[in-house]
């Protein structure tokens, strides 16, 4: 149940009052307002929206609302020198060219400044050569090509389908394989759900639709020119050659009409198996190069985008806490979009706006939260989580001492089937308890709780009667707070049925067709799913900011630590001989997990029994809870990834979007059978087990009685 212990509390100023104030109609109105023109990071339009949000948050009643600006590296196409891909004949004549723009959707034909599809941060270049089809360009796809099929991508232009993993990982893999260019395309197998029409008649991707996106491999660095430090007025900037995470080969995205023209001519090797075939009427031959009649034709890329240091603006709103103003609960989501941002990000920004309005209403009636709530509208998320990361770098000393929790608020929907939550184990019980108190918006679950519909539609693979909650990965603005600073974090949105819809993300992701009408006509006409997401996100913030004892359960961390230790041990045990040869033992890790479990259990008992009227003891216990996530941070970071410092979780090295548990050990074990120096490789496994065991033990000790 919600706790109602803020100062000036009256019976009506509780969680229920906050939730009842949230209105679907307001979210709808805000979404419309935020999606009428493009709000690309670094543009005047997005600056104007920042000022509008600042003004409205002030009107809603926040104590202060400031703009925080940074000068960061962004990337834009050259207006006079467009990006495109050609097929050229033996004389060098262009016999086919890909489209420059997506056809604008109905009603938007006359909107100016739609940015054409491009891969942000692609270097300039005009490589030409034979094409190799590399499936999703995952690590395992290149293993298949290089090791099994003996196909060499060196000096080739590779074409990869979007989906499964973050596009930046695809580009990194292609670079490592020696490719000299990358073409990314959306295959209907991944972006066209059967039985649904393409936009504007349905929510599927039309043939001319293209997914934009950055192709960086920042590994949490933020602005590529100022890693570790804010990109402020006196910043020292690296030269472009030393910038973090920039791709070294040209990259460009296309739609499936244009992809068809490239893929239909492919020759060379047949696809290795059916998992390499999409839904186009093409053979999905791997290449290299075109088939017989077209073997003299080549592919040529024309990429002229430029990287430019550009000013960006975050909006930071503060609602001061009445009892513990030096404890911060943060709700943040981005404002910048690739084009109209109908789903990404404005379905999230509209929810944040309504949450701010509801908190403001309570504040105007004399209420304050116990702890300070910070609201953030981040800029330049689409260019590498830049706004949130720069702000966190600027405020890192405050955040690491005062940060209680961060709740992310990007897209509120990626479907309309059920809830999806990714969070720290510390928040599992908070999420369970909250969703038991909320009504389900789902058809067939009238009068039932959100917890019930969520559990039915997305059951936990481990625990019956409980819903699935996933690990945090990255690809969104929680990254710096969780992976770098160790602040307990969570995110929630409505999602699709992953069992029946196997396409990646939602079909119109990052295309011009992500409009207000897409949401209003096809995803959530009544805005009931948006309202539910507002209740979940807002409810989490309310409880984190207002409960006397922080709603964190350290016992849930103990449970997952054991699960993750079992998993990594079983991966290692695929090499029993080497484990014996190199004396690899997981005893220290299992011992640390056992200690953590026992200490967490005792701490939880003390948490039930202590005198909550003693403010010193209360603050002490809450600080132990707040700092538990921080205790999993290794100041040295993970190997070659200094800004990923969480020892229990990191974004997968093979897919930024996915979370990996015990990532240091996992990466040390990955493909270990192919390492040239097995002794050194297994030595690194042992070192990573040591780091993990030490960290778990050290974290456990923060929960012990203080003296």
């Amino acid at each position: 149940k919600s706790s109602n212990e803020a100062t000036n509390i009256t019976p009506k100023h509780n969680m229920k009052a906050f939730l009842d104030e949230l209105k679907a109609e307001n979210i709808k109105k805000f979404l419309y307002n935020f999606t009428q023109i493009p709000h690309l990071a670094g543009t005047e339009q997005n600056f104007q929206l920042a000022k509008q949000i600042q003004s409205q948050w002030k009107e809603f009643g926040l104590d202060s609302v400031e703009l925080a600006h940074y000068d960061v590296l962004l990337s834009y196409p050259n207006k006079t020198h467009p990006n495109y891909i050609s097929i050229i004949n033996e004389d060098g004549n262009e016999i086919f060219n890909t489209s420059l723009f997506e056809p604008p959707p109905p009603g938007y034909e006359n909107v100016s400044d739609i940015v054409p599809p491009f891969s942000a941060f692609s270097p300039q270049g005009m490589p030409e050569g034979d094409l190799v089809y590399v499936n999703y360009a995952r690590t395992e796809d290149f293993f298949k090509l290089e090791r099994d099929m003996k196909i060499n991508c060196s000096g080739k232009i590779v074409i990869a389908r979007y989906g499964k993993v973050f596009r930046g990982n695809k580009v990194k893999n292609a670079q490592l394989a020696g490719a000299k260019g990358v073409i990314l395309y959306s295959d209907p197998a991944d972006y066209f759900a059967p039985g649904v029409k393409s936009y504007p008649d349905g929510w599927n991707l039309p043939g001319g639709g293209v997914q934009r996106g950055n192709i960086l491999n920042l590994n949490g660095a933020g602005d590529p020119l100022t890693p570790g430090y804010p990109a402020n007025e006196y910043a020292y900037r690296r030269g472009i050659a030393e910038a973090v995470g920039l791709p070294s080969i040209p990259v460009h995205p296309i739609g499936y009409y244009d992809a068809q023209k490239l893929l239909e001519k492919m020759g060379g090797s047949a696809p290795p198996d059916s998992s390499w075939r999409g839904s186009l009427k093409v053979p999905y031959n791997v290449g290299p190069g075109f088939t017989g009649n077209f073997s003299t034709q080549k592919v040529k890329m024309h990429i002229h985008s430029t990287n430019e240091v550009t000013r960006i603006y975050n909006v930071i709103g503060t609602l001061r806490g009445a009892v513990e103003p030096d404890r911060y609960v943060i709700l943040g989501g981005h404002r910048d979009s690739w084009v109209f941002g109908g789903i990404d990000p404005q379905s999230g920004a509209a929810v944040v706006h309504e949450i701010v309005r509801s908190f403001g209403t309570l504040k105007k009636e004399g209420w304050r939260p116990r702890r300070t709530i910070l609201f953030a509208s981040w800029d330049a998320e689409e260019f590498g989580l830049l706004g949130s990361t720069e702000w966190a770098e600027e405020n890192s000393r405050l955040l690491q001492e005062r940060g209680v929790a961060y709740i992310n608020a990007d897209s509120s929907i990626e479907g309309n089937y059920t809830l999806r939550v990714d969070c720290t184990p510390l928040m599992y019980s908070l999420v369970h308890n909250l969703t038991k108190e909320l009504k389900s918006p789902d058809e067939g679950f009238e009068g039932k709780s959100l917890y019930e519909s969520w559990t039915k539609k997305s059951p936990s693979p481990e625990f019956s009667g409980m819903p699935r909650i996933s690990k945090l990965g990255s690809g969104n603005d929680f990254e710096v707070f969780f992976q770098r600073l160790g602040i307990a974090s969570g995110r929630a949105r409505y999602t699709k049925n992953w069992e029946t819809n196997k396409f990646s993300g939602y079909p119109l992701y990052h295309s011009v067709y992500e409009t207000y009408e897409l949401v209003e006509k096809f995803y959530d006409p009544m805005f009931k799913y948006h309202l539910t997401v507002a209740q979940v996100r807002g409810g989490m913030v309310f409880e984190l900011a207002n409960s006397i004892v922080l709603p964190f359960d350290c016992r849930d961390y103990a449970v997952v630590l054991r699960k993750y230790a079992d998993k990594i041990y079983s991966i290692s045990m695929k090499h029993p001989q080497e484990m014996k040869t190199y004396s690899v033992s997981f005893d220290s890790l299992f011992s640390a997990v056992k200690n953590f479990t026992e200490i967490a259990s005792k701490f939880s008992e003390r948490l039930q029994d202590f005198d909550k009227s003693n403010p010193i003891v209360l603050r002490m216990m809450n600080d132990q809870l707040m700092f538990l996530e921080r205790a999993f941070i290794d100041p040295l970071g993970l190997p070659d990834r200094p800004f990923y410092r969480h020892v229990i979780y990191a974004p997968s090295s093979h897919n930024k979007y996915a979370g990996e548990s015990f990532p240091g050990i996992y990466d040390a074990l990955f493909d270990i059978e192919s390492k040239v120096d097995p002794s050194k490789a297994w030595g690194e496994v042992k070192r990573q087990i040591y780091v993990a065991a030490f960290t778990v033990q050290a974290a456990a000790e923060t929960l012990s009685e203080v003296a």
């Epitope: 060219n97 890909t98 489209s99 420059l100 056809p103 604008p104 009409y257 244009d258 023209k261």
Partner: nanobody
Amino acid sequence: QVQLQQSGGGLVQPGGSLRLSCADSGSIFRINTMHWYRQAPGKQRELVATITSGGSTNYADSVKGRFTISRDNTKNTMYLQMNSLKAEDTAVYYCYTYYYRAYWGQGTQVTVSS
């Protein structure tokens, strides 16, 4: 400054044919997707046909099988061949493309009447 210059159109009997042309003065448009729209009196503007730089085409259901969109990139010109015309095809036809902003032809009246 890019111009889209339309020609063709006029009065034709039901069942007849017409060909519309749209020439552009910009080299960029040779490699851009082009469209034909139409607007009948008192009705909303309607997308009729689309052709990508690579020649992929799309048609409104109402004109499928009767209209053909094509382009000649050497002449920077796009065409709309309209066969089996019906009274409901009567409208002002516009060619259109987009490159950071909208570019429209001046419009061509097509009237189908006996």
